[in-house]
Interface confidence: medium
Amino acid sequence: SEVEYRAEVGQNAYLPCFYTPAAPGNLVPVCWGKGACPVFECGNVVLRTDERDVNYWTSRYWLNGDFRKGDVSLTIENVTLADSGIYCCRIQIPGIMNDEKFNLKLVIK
């Protein structure tokens, strides 16, 4: 089951997601998507990182912490009721079926 997080309309929502890089600066690609984690990748991608930096993001969706140290927590700014739902944080570890997948449920009130 998904871990549940709450936020109020008009406030910022915080969805935590962390991993430990194998070595400083040795990053693993990460994607955030709206909807539960599928078998591969993320559906409805809202933000993505590569081995070096954030390479895709959409309005209101930002990385909240120091992603170069493995904090890939997501901030959704100024949320509305439409932002409710499941979000997928996927740590795309190299190799077959090695990905770490986290489904987080956001409840807006």
């Epitope: 910022n12 400083p24 600066g25 933000l47 990182t49 930096d53 954030v54 390479n55 895709y56 993001w57 309005s59 209101r60 930002w62 990385l63 909240n64 912490g65 120091d66 992603f67 170069r68 140290k69 901030t75 700014e77 100024n78």
Partner: antibody, heavy 122, light 108 residues
Framework: EVQLLESGGGLVQPGGSLRLSCAAS????????MSWVRQAPGKCLEWVSA????????YYADSVKGRFTISRDNSKNTLYLQMNSLRAEDTAVYYC???????????????WGRGTLVTVSS | QTVLTQPPSVSVAPGKTASISCGGD??????VHWYQQKPGQAPVLVIY???DRPSGIPQRFSGSNSGNTATLTIHRVEAGDEADYYC???????????FGCGTKLTVL
């Protein structure tokens, strides 16, 4: 080419007000967190305030909280700093700086303006 | 709140290697960024995320960060490298950006 141009500095008496502006060009302004950083004559750099790309979230150094207000007009590609109840210790060159992309807090300051001098003196 | 400690000054002969330290409690757990500032000019980013170099910054500039110390290293120092160098981190506990008080690099 990214450009940041500050204006609005000058001489003001203690207790007075000033509004600084920073005109930005060469990038999608609303996609980036922006900050103000100041440097008193011969002193260190001091972060003053920051604002998220949408303008929905703001942050202030303790030394200016309650006196300064940061804002932005994304339709005009302009960042502002409203400074009230100015003190002698606010005398400094004020720089606007652009944060790194895709990050809520900006994390590092990739581009800087040339600065505008604010002098608070009677 | 984290405090960043830099030596006030470092002197080095041309062609040699300069190392500028930035100390802070468990600074290795944070990303450190470095800026160069020449007299009368705005700061310029020279290293970000501990060791990455922006385009246009010579390969002679490098950075490292571990434990309680981050280090900016300038190899084959040139006269034009003479400047103040500042380290910077984002303190997530306070959501404040912190700068060290700068190190003046003098090229002898």
């Amino acid at each position: 080419e990214v450009q940041l141009l500050e204006s609005g500095g000058g001489l003001v008496q203690p207790g007075g007000s000033l509004r600084l502006s920073c005109a930005a060009s060469g990038f999608t302004f609303s996609s980036y967190a922006m900050s103000w950083v100041r440097q008193a004559p011969g002193k260190c750099l001091e972060w003053v305030s920051a604002i998220s790309g949408s303008g929905g979230s703001t942050y202030y150094a303790d030394s200016v909280k309650g006196r300064f207000t940061i804002s932005r007009d994304n339709s005009k590609n302009t960042l502002y700093l409203q400074m009230n109840s100015l003190r002698a210790e606010d005398t400094a060159v004020y720089y606007c700086a652009r944060g790194s992309y895709g990050t809520y807090y900006g994390n590092y300051f990739e581009y800087w303006g040339r600065g505008t001098l604010v002098t608070v003196s009677s | 709140q984290t405090v960043l400690t830099q030596p006030p000054s470092v002197s080095v002969a041309p062609g040699k290697t300069a190392s500028i330290s930035c100390g802070g409690d468990n600074i290795g757990g944070k990303s450190v960024h470095w800026y160069q500032q020449k007299p009368g000019q705005a700061p310029v980013l020279v290293i970000y995320y501990d060791s990455d170099r922006p385009s246009g910054i010579p390969q002679r500039f490098s950075g490292s960060n571990s434990g309680n110390t981050a280090t900016l290293t300038i190899h084959r120092v040139e006269a034009g490298d003479e400047a103040d160098y500042y380290c910077q981190v984002l303190d997530r506990r306070s959501d404040h950006w912190l700068f060290g008080c700068g190190t003046k690099l003098t090229v002898l």
